[in-house]
Interface confidence: medium
């Protein structure tokens, strides 16, 4: 059976696969997924290894028409470095010389300057080029190599290993060499995989059942450390509770060097955030931190300084802490917009079982604003999801120059933010550089401000506008309002009408359904439309909703189903990558973000058309 990293190298023109007959003969044969000699895999960013021989594809020189054969893998050799060129060409790095089928006289695979069909290769059984199953570095744990990545293949007691092994051990622990020759270099680490006993790499907090892994001997950049945690189905540490900080202070008390945690300000337009999307509501900065120096966007926990936090440049090499297991945030259920009939008094706006009202003109200090909201039967607004924030921005009449009190504050416990309505903190969206919480200016209250409505801490004594929120009163069955210019069941936003397609459909089926309704699969022109769509579908239980974006027509170039330019994107992390397919919006914690899915997957969808009676603005000229 092929493991997911392995592939067969297929030439469509000949309908044959590359076959490593011997280290000196790399030819082609009828494709056979069970033949070890036809299995290959990437073992570095640019090396391809034969699974059968544990040797790498290479050439004797970078010249035209030389045989491609197998060599002992050497990550430094220029003659083993391959790269995918446009679409399905595979070339030697830095040259216009390609992996080629050979010819009738030449049975061996050759390096050749021609880029025709005989130089075009796919992964057998797919339409993908060879790079689509690229190499993912595996960061080691413990050992003696400072968390370096596994070097595959590596030599141990004169035998080559292309995977982690328990050779030399009776306990089944999996390890790898971090250089190609363990026998000479003696550098190794344990693999971030599940094996008998791997749980002992984690410390479980008995109170919360959350597990933590302290990698104090590693030396990785912040991004590498995050990748290492993710390889173990974990994330860099987030700390949202005082108890959690206390537990970690104890866990790291014998250490001295800094350890990366998940806190960062890497998002260009927002402030401090946890990489696992936990709310940033508890602060434990080292005095003088966070420093405002540019580039210091990642945060380390300092065991030698009472486990307080300091922002550093993300390229520094440090140890790190991973976290996995239960999160306390999931216990608070936010009702879906569609679950709750929402009826609100005049001048209040409904959303997901609550009513909202902006008081922009009557400026009040935070305490008085809170009193007013409570007199009206509500509280200063709490915000629990990106969808709720998007609703406030796109539907409630929020304006880019607003600065409005919301209910978040750390009045009760310094550096520990809570909502004034007592609901749990499940989400935060701070402005860049926030929360600044400058001690000389007691900044205990929080405002929404700027074009995106992101948050900043502020002295509570400023007179500002504010947003109130209250639970709605249910009044029998909901009356479906027909929005002006839209048919029944469609929702209006600006010049357009939108409808959720409730039948699970492939991309093509969804597109057809929309067309039958004189509409099209939704386009998304800017972040305001995205905000609307996020609030429209983001809280629904289904995982995905098709948009009209795909690269069906031209692989690698994403286009809308209607002739409209792609001017805005909202990709999820690691998207679009090299995956071809169709684009759907996520719901839930990644609400609104775009993922590339296989086009024949089934999902719900959003149709869109011009509202009636709306004058079309002229198309922008380019």
């Amino acid at each position: 059976l092929l493991d997911t990293r392995q592939f067969l190298i297929y030439n469509e023109d000949h309908k044959r696969c590359v076959d490593a007959v011997s280290p000196s003969a790399v030819q082609t044969a009828a494709c056979n997924q069970d033949a070890e000699s036809q299995k290959f895999r990437w073992v570095s960013e640019s090396q391809i290894m034969s699974v059968a021989f544990k040797l790498c594809l290479g050439v004797p020189s970078k010249t035209d028409w030389v045989a491609i054969t197998l060599y002992a893998c050497d990550s430094k050799s220029e003659f083993q470095k391959w790269e995918c060129k446009n679409d399905t060409l595979l070339g030697i790095k830095g040259e216009d010389l390609f992996f080629n089928y050979g010819n009738r006289q030449e049975k061996n695979i050759m390096l050749y300057k021609g880029s025709g069909l005989w130089s075009r290769w796919k992964i057998y059984g797919t339409t993908d080029n060879l790079c689509s199953r690229g190499y993912e570095a595996m960061y080691t744990l413990l050992g003696n190599a400072n968390g370096a990545t596994c070097a595959f293949p590596f030599k141990f007691e004169n035998k080559w290993y292309a995977d982690c092994t328990s050779a030399g051990r009776s306990d089944g622990w999996l390890w790898c060499g971090t250089t190609t020759d363990y026998d000479t270099d003696k550098l190794f680490g344990y693999c971030p995989l599940k094996f008998e006993g791997s749980e002992s790499l984690w410390n479980k907090d008995p109170l919360t059942s959350v597990s933590y892994q302290i990698n104090s001997k590693s030396a990785l950049t912040w991004h590498q450390a995050r990748k290492s945690c993710q390889q173990q189905n974990a994330e860099l540490l987030s700390i949202t509770e005082i108890h959690e900080q206390t537990y970690l202070t104890g866990l790291t008390s014998s250490l001295t060097s800094g350890l990366w945690i998940g806190l960062n300000s890497l998002s260009f337009n927002s402030g401090w955030q946890w990489s696992d999307r936990s709310p940033f509501r508890y602060l434990n900065w080292l005095p003088g931190s966070p420093s405002a120096e540019p580039g210091k966007s990642c945060v380390s926990l300092n065991p030698g300084k009472n486990a307080k936090w300091e922002n550093l440049e993300c390229v520094q090499k440090l140890g790190y802490i991973c976290k996995k297991g239960n999160t306390t945030l999931n216990s608070f259920v936010i009702p879906s917009e569609s679950d709750v009939p929402t009826h609100c008094p005049s001048q209040w706006w409904p959303y997901a079982g609550h009513c909202y009202k902006i008081h922009r003109d009557e400026k009040k200090i935070q305490r008085d604003a809170l009193t007013t909201c409570r007199k009206e039967g509500g509280d200063l607004t709490s915000i629990h999801t990106i969808e709720e924030l998007d609703f406030i921005i796109s539907q409630l009449g929020y304006e880019p120059n607003d600065e409005l009190w919301i209910g978040l504050n750390d009045i009760k416990i310094q550096m520990y933010f809570e909502w004034s309505d007592g609901t749990p903190v499940t989400f935060t969206k701070w402005l860049r550089g926030e929360p600044s919480h400058e001690n000389n200016r007691q900044e205990d209250c929080v405002v929404m401000k700027g074009k995106d409505g992101y948050w900043a801490d502020r002295g509570c004594e400023w007179p500002l506008g504010y947003i109130c929120k209250m639970k709605s009163r249910s009044q029998g069955p909901e009356i479906v309002e027909v929005e002006k210019g839209c048919r029944k069941g469609w929702k209006k936003h600006h010049f357009y009408c939108y409808m959720i397609g409730h039948t699970l459909s492939t991309f093509a089926e969804a597109n057809q359904t929309c067309n039958n309704e004189n509409a099209y699969l939704t386009t998304i022109e800017d972040r305001y439309e995205q905000a609307f769509l996020t609030s429209f579908v983001g809280l629904r239980p289904e995982k995905y909703f098709w948009t009209g974006l795909s690269d069906i027509q031209t692989k690698g170039t994403f286009q809308w189903t209607i002739e409209e330019e792609v001017r805005f994107t909202h990709w999820n992390s690691d998207m679009p990558g090299r995956k071809p397919g169709c684009v759907a919006m996520r719901t839930g914690i990644a609400g609104g973000l775009w993922d590339v899915l296989k086009c024949d997957e089934k999902a719900k969808f959003v149709c869109k058309h011009w509202a009636e009676g709306v004058t079309h603005p002229p198309k922008p000229t380019t």
Partner: nanobody, 119 residues
């Protein structure tokens, strides 16, 4: 490299007690399991008792109820409390550690400590 140092062996009368200790030192990242072994007729060494870092124990049928294995993780030390000793348990007792070390090898043995049960 890992060193194991056994101690506590000696001469004891039938029915008497002894406590064996084994301390591990060297390039240990974390210790998985430690145990006590003795030579046996049909195999090189038979397992007497072992204990994991989490405290799970395992005993040979012949010593159940009379021998107790325990460990101190902080000191990387394992103990074997031997009660109601009989002459037939006379042997060299070897300590073995299966450890996560700064080499990929896992099994380390001590030099052994002699237990003699005789009147």
């Amino acid at each position: 490299y890992v060193q194991l140092a056994e101690s506590g062996g000696g001469l004891v009368q039938p029915g008497g007690s002894l406590i064996l200790s084994c301390a591990a030192s060297g390039s240990i990242c974390t210790s998985n399991a430690m145990g006590w072994y003795r030579p046996a007729l049909w195999k090189q060494r038979e397992e007497v008792a072992d204990i994991t870092s989490g405290g799970s124990t395992n005993y040979a049928d012949s010593v159940k109820g009379r021998f107790t294995i325990s460990r101190d993780n902080a000191k990387n030390t394992v103990y074997l409390q031997m009660n109601s000793l009989k002459p037939k348990v006379t042997a060299v007792y070897y300590c073995k550690a299966v450890v996560v070390t700064t080499t990929p090898y896992s099994d380390y043995w001590g030099q052994g400590t002699l237990v003699t049960v005789s009147s």
